[in-house]
């Protein structure tokens, strides 16, 4: 199975964001961008008639959230 | 299956001027952040810009900054190079990559690049 | 620019061997270091992401450690298909950069 990559910024990431809520903070960049509209699950595979168990993070899905911390899947990557 | 094909390569002459491009399929092209990475004949990689899913930042590196623009038409799945006054340190295998990110909360975090074209050679030459 | 430099830069192994290349970043860069794998006439392949994430679809002889300057790639046991060039690139800021490469060579 593979792993998950862990938070990685720590103390580089400020918290809260500066960005409103429709936008995201890009790390690589460090300003806000636009994200709202790319906040939807992936399409599921075909054939499927509900989502099979995440075991494993797949590319374009978000990574585990801390408790308390919403994280969003995201079929795009800005 | 996710693919990139890319074209435009070729021999051109020093000041003068190429477009590469390069065609997306199997995924939502209009969601994802893109490079142009190339390489040297023998040399390593060497990173040359970089565009948001919707255009809205362009960043550059220091080699091509103002002779190079990166760009794309999200309709045609399509993603471009336009190579101006080409200069020889120019030729090089150029390569399309979609960028890799996660979200968590609201941030964005960076990881590489997932997927590659099968690469372009520009060769510039007199 | 933050400059990203291997070691070595060639190696001669056999398969099965245990082969590990370093990489030192100039600054610190947290785990935002990623590795690939090319091949002659072939693009690049991601393998390792985030220091220690293993992309989807590479082989579990692949792994990848470190955070902060200095990280590592690990290929467990050697096959016959990972003789090829490995790069270490960190995605902590704009320019990206990439090391200088490894080449994985039979011995």
């Known amino acids: 199975m593979r792993r998950g990559p862990r938070s990685l910024r720590g103390r580089d990431a400020p918290a809260p964001t500066p960005c409103v809520p429709a936008e995201c903070f890009d790390l690589l960049v460090r300003h806000c961008v636009a994200c709202g509209l790319l906040r939807t699950p992936r399409p599921k595979p075909a054939g499927a008639s509900s989502p099979a168990p995440r075991t494993a993070l797949q590319p374009q899905e978000s990574v585990g959230a801390g408790a308390g911390e919403a994280a969003l899947p995201l079929p795009g990557l800005l | 299956e996710v693919q990139l094909v890319q074209s435009g390569g070729g021999v051109v002459q020093p000041g003068r001027s190429l477009r590469l491009s390069c065609a997306a399929s199997g995924f939502t092209f209009s969601s994802y952040g893109m490079h142009w990475v190339r390489q040297a004949p023998g040399k390593g990689l060497e990173w040359v810009a970089v565009i948001w899913y919707d255009a809205s930042n362009k960043y550059y590196g220091d080699s091509v900054k103002g002779r190079f623009t990166i760009s794309r038409d999200n309709s045609k799945n399509t993603l471009y190079l336009q190579m101006n006054s080409l200069r020889d340190e120019d030729t090089a295998v150029y390569y399309c990559a979609r960028r890799f990110t996660h979200l968590r909360g609201q941030y964005i975090e960076d990881y590489g690049l997932d997927v590659w074209g099968q690469g372009t050679t520009v060769t510039v030459s007199s | 620019e933050i400059v990203l430099t291997q070691s070595p830069s060639s190696l001669s192994a056999s398969v099965g061997d245990r082969v590990t290349i370093t990489c030192r970043a100039s600054q610190s860069i947290s785990s935002y270091l990623n590795w690939y794998q090319q091949k002659p006439g072939k693009a690049p392949k991601l393998l390792i992401y985030?220091?220690?994430s293993l992309q989807s679809g590479v082989p579990s002889r692949f792994s990848g450690s470190g955070s902060g300057t200095d990280f590592t790639l690990t290929i467990s046991s050697l096959q016959p298909e990972d003789f090829a060039t490995y790069y270490c690139?960190?995605?902590?800021?704009?320019?990206?950069?990439f090391g200088g490469g490894t080449k994985v060579e039979i011995k």
């Open positions: 690139q960190q995605s902590y800021s704009i320019p990206l950069t």
């Open positions: 985030a220091a220690s």
